[in-house]
Interface confidence: medium
Amino acid sequence: RKAVLDCEAMKTNEFPSPCLDSKTKVVMKGQNVSMFCSHKNKSLQITYSLFRRKTHLGTQDGKGEPAIFNLSITEAHESGPYKCKAQVTSCSKYSRDFSFTIVDPVTSPVLNIMVIQTETDRHITLHCLSVNGSLPINYTFFENHVAISPAISKYDREPAEFNLTKKNPGEEEEYRCEAKNRLPNYATYSHPVTMPSTGGDSCPFCLK
């Protein structure tokens, strides 16, 4: 009877639900992740168990430190939901569900340039498209390694477009674009396209 009373006391006071988290919430297939199951009570030795849906994945013991489970997300069904159980003797509590968002990485985008040449100006239209990768994709255009556009979000598989007008330049300019989706620290760049310094025959992108 005393054990039951102690357990009830722990459930309400010292033994709240554990917290399940990961530093990485948006992942691509094949990515390694670490899941942390932690508890506010730092004085008890707690047995932590990790579940995906109803499948028991693993168990470890800890006191004062979060339990760390190291997984590889290789298939869509491994996105979750995950749940962590914290147990002390006969008392156990479950965390809230945690799920990963699986995102396909963007492939290197293709940059296309169209130029309308006038006597004094060049009207440049830049198109950038990544044909693979989970939407939305944010595109940014660069001139000589400096961003010249804001991030342009595309929610469909259509190229991002950016227009600019330049005085006929005296030197070559290099353009490229960046494609990025919700995957953190994962961006891809197009091959650079160099615009020659003068008009005429040396402007292969120009519409006369």
Epitope: Q45, T47, L50, Q60, D61, G62, K63, I68, N70, S72
Partner: antibody, heavy 121, light 111 residues
């Protein structure tokens, strides 16, 4: 049946290098952390290090810098690279599987038969 | 790192005897302790984990107790196949480290 089979041991000169292999069968290596443990003749068991399921490695302080653990999940094999070997590294080297899945905080439910490394000139 | 001290380093006993081996950790490890049996020329075999949980297939004459820093392995009635060396092992982890530490063994021989 779960099996661990070490290989690559033998006689090596002081200052030399050796790579030990541990071939696993009967389970998927990608779900378990693995450790190497050694035992000098007539002496205690000595933990060398552990590699986690996501390839994070942990080493005993004395093993850092000279010993490197790696794994190839496609071959279901774990490796121990040993450099700058000394006479005191003479021992039977065991690979061992941590019992609990996806964690390095565990005990050893399966051991290989061991491979003898002798460091002598 | 945590150090594990086992005692005695060796003991002699007869079949049917009750045998007790102790293991002390240099700092509190909760119940993160395992016991192994090793016979000459063989790999260690897991007997007990989490200080007191019997591994599947291990005879019930083996039992473990203790938590914090002091642990005990008891063989209630020694059998001929129990003459071997016994090791304790602590296992520990944190977000930045993970390590195991073994005691130096207790050799149980025939009296």
């Amino acid at each position: 049946e779960v099996q661990l089979v070490e290989s690559g041991g033998g006689l090596v000169q002081p200052g030399g290098s050796l790579r030990l292999s541990c071939a696993a069968s009967g389970f998927s290596l990608s779900s378990h952390a693995m450790s190497w443990v050694r035992q000098a003749p007539g002496k205690c068991l000595e933990w060398i290090g552990t590699i986690s399921t996501i390839d994070t490695t942990y080493y005993a302080s004395w093993a850092k810098g000279r010993f490197t653990i790696s794994r190839d999940n496609s071959k279901n094999t774990v490796y121990l690279q040993m450099n700058s070997l000394r006479a005191e590294d003479t021992a039977v080297y065991y690979c061992a599987r941590l019992s609990e899945l996806y964690t390095t905080n565990s005990y050893y439910s399966r051991w290989g038969q061991g491979t003898l490394v002798t460091v002598s000139s | 790192d945590i150090q594990m001290t086992q005692s005695p380093s060796s003991l002699s006993a007869s079949v049917g005897d009750r045998v007790t081996i102790t293991c002390q950790a240099s700092e509190s490890i909760g119940s993160l302790l395992a016991w192994y049996q090793q016979k000459p020329g063989k790999a260690p075999k897991l007997l007990i984990y989490r200080a007191s949980t019997l591994e599947s297939g291990v005879p019930s004459r083996f039992s473990g107790s203790g938590s914090g820093t002091d642990f005990t392995l008891t063989i209630s009635s020694l059998q001929p196949e129990d003459f071997a060396t016994y090791y304790c092992q602590s296992y520990h982890y944190s977000s930045s480290s993970s390590y195991a530490a073994f005691g130096c063994g207790t050799k149980v021989t025939v009296l």
